[in-house]
């Protein structure tokens, strides 16, 4: 990805998805009526013109927000602590990798706008998730809906990272 982002970053992202999957506590079949449109900003991860700074910023903010969401008293009460600790550790490692990378990308002169804009959009999205959890009184079903939503958005963000990686590979081989 044009910086010292380790090859295992993609693996860490997949591990995060696996952990989120394992964290399931109740059957999602019981929670259909609690579905909500959180309006994940798809346009942010679907574009074909991927800038390194944009991808790094989206991933960094996503992981930062997931870390914050699952690093609260409410979250500790809702989830298996062993899995939660593993999630925190994995997210912390990924954030460290990305921060190193972001510093280099900024140093290479990529625009600050490409970094600040996705961050603001994602903060609004996660604020909507927090409001929903509060509104639903942090019920098991509310957490289950949020877990599934985060798996979906993280999956889309990881896909964006893979697309940039393969684009870089194509450029490197041509």
């Amino acid at each position: 990805l044009g910086c010292d982002l380790p090859q295992n970053h993609g693996l860490l992202s997949r591990n995060t998805l696996v952990l989120l999957h394992q964290m399931r506590r109740i059957s999602p079949f019981l929670c259909l009526k609690d579905r909500r449109d959180f309006r994940f900003p798809q346009e942010m991860v679907k574009g074909s013109q991927l800038q390194k700074a944009h991808v790094m910023s989206v991933l960094h903010e996503m992981l930062q927000q997931i870390f914050s969401l699952f690093h609260t008293e409410r979250s500790s009460a809702a989830w298996n602590m062993t899995l939660l600790d593993q999630l925190h550790t994995g997210l912390h490692q990924q954030l460290q990798h990305l921060e190193t990378c972001l510093l280099q990308v900024v140093g290479e002169g990529e625009s600050a706008g490409a970094i600040s804009s996705p961050a603001l959009t994602l903060r609004r999205y996660f604020q909507g998730i927090r409001v929903y959890l509060k509104e639903k009184k942090y019920s098991d079903c509310a957490w289950e809906v949020v877990r599934m939503e985060i798996m979906k958005s993280l999956f889309l963000s990881t896909n964006m990272q893979e697309r940039l990686r393969s684009k870089d590979r194509d450029l490197g081989s041509s």
Epitope: P28, F29, R35, E149
Partner: antibody, heavy 121, light 107 residues
């Protein structure tokens, strides 16, 4: 392109067993649930049950509980509907369809082409 | 289980007519209601989801409304390809349930 491709038509005798399939492609198979729907000749749609292929969690309509078994093999992106002992009244068209689970997206947006099951002595 | 009741069970109409089909749930299902169209020998096709959202690729003459227990599917100007059977389905809670269907025939 998203596709659900079902196995071909079956002609069976009462008391025989049967397993029909529904193969998903063009999307992340474990990110969607697969539902099964029955349509008896000249009748309406009846919801049978659903499976989450990511962990094979299932739920059935009370009318079909104990009558059929729904399963999935995520390694080959395929869901199954099976009977251990068919009856003449199982004669119908069976459809599979994908469901987005708890994600906010269209329900049952893609359907298989249907599998016609005929049970006759 | 939630019962879904559609009316009418069949109707005759002409090309260009405005057609309305109603669906009533035995208890509140919020906006978790879908409408499907089915033609003979074909799989059902999703038209409307979450009561009023038009599925991608479906003509804008189809619209849905309602919430709670009472829902409506409207075809603003019936086209020859719209003669089919229409089903409502609730996805608020399992088991999902369908209405009995409304057959739209040519007058």
């Amino acid at each position: 392109e998203v596709q659900l491709v079902q196995s071909g038509a079956e002609v069976k005798k009462p008391g025989e067993s049967l397993k029909i399939s529904c193969k998903g492609s063009g999307y992340s198979f474990t990110s969607y649930w697969i539902g099964w729907v029955r349509q008896m000749p000249g009748k309406g749609l009846e919801w049978m049950g659903i499976i989450d292929p990511s962990d094979s969690d299932t739920a059935y309509s009370p009318s079909f509980q104990g009558q059929v078994t729904i399963s999935a093999d995520k390694s080959i992106s395929t869901a199954y509907l099976q009977w251990s002992s068919l009856k003449a009244s199982d004669t119908a068209m069976y459809y599979c369809a994908r469901h987005p689970g708890l994600n906010w997206a269209p329900d049952f947006d893609y359907w298989g082409q249907g599998t016609l099951v005929t049970v006759s002595s | 289980d939630i019962q879904m009741t559609q009316s009418p069970s069949s109707l005759s109409a002409s090309v260009g007519d405005r057609v309305t089909i109603t669906c009533r749930a035995s208890q509140s299902i919020s906006k978790f209601l879908n409408w499907y169209q089915q033609k003979p020998g074909k799989a059902p096709k999703l038209l409307i989801y979450f009561a009023s959202s038009l599925q991608s690729g479906v003509p804008s003459r189809f619209s849905g409304s309602g919430s709670g227990t009472d829902f409506t599917l409207t075809i603003s100007s019936l086209q020859p390809e719209d003669f089919a059977t229409y089903y409502c389905q609730q996805s608020n809670t399992l088991p999902f349930t369908f209405g009995q269907g409304t057959k739209v025939e040519i007058k």
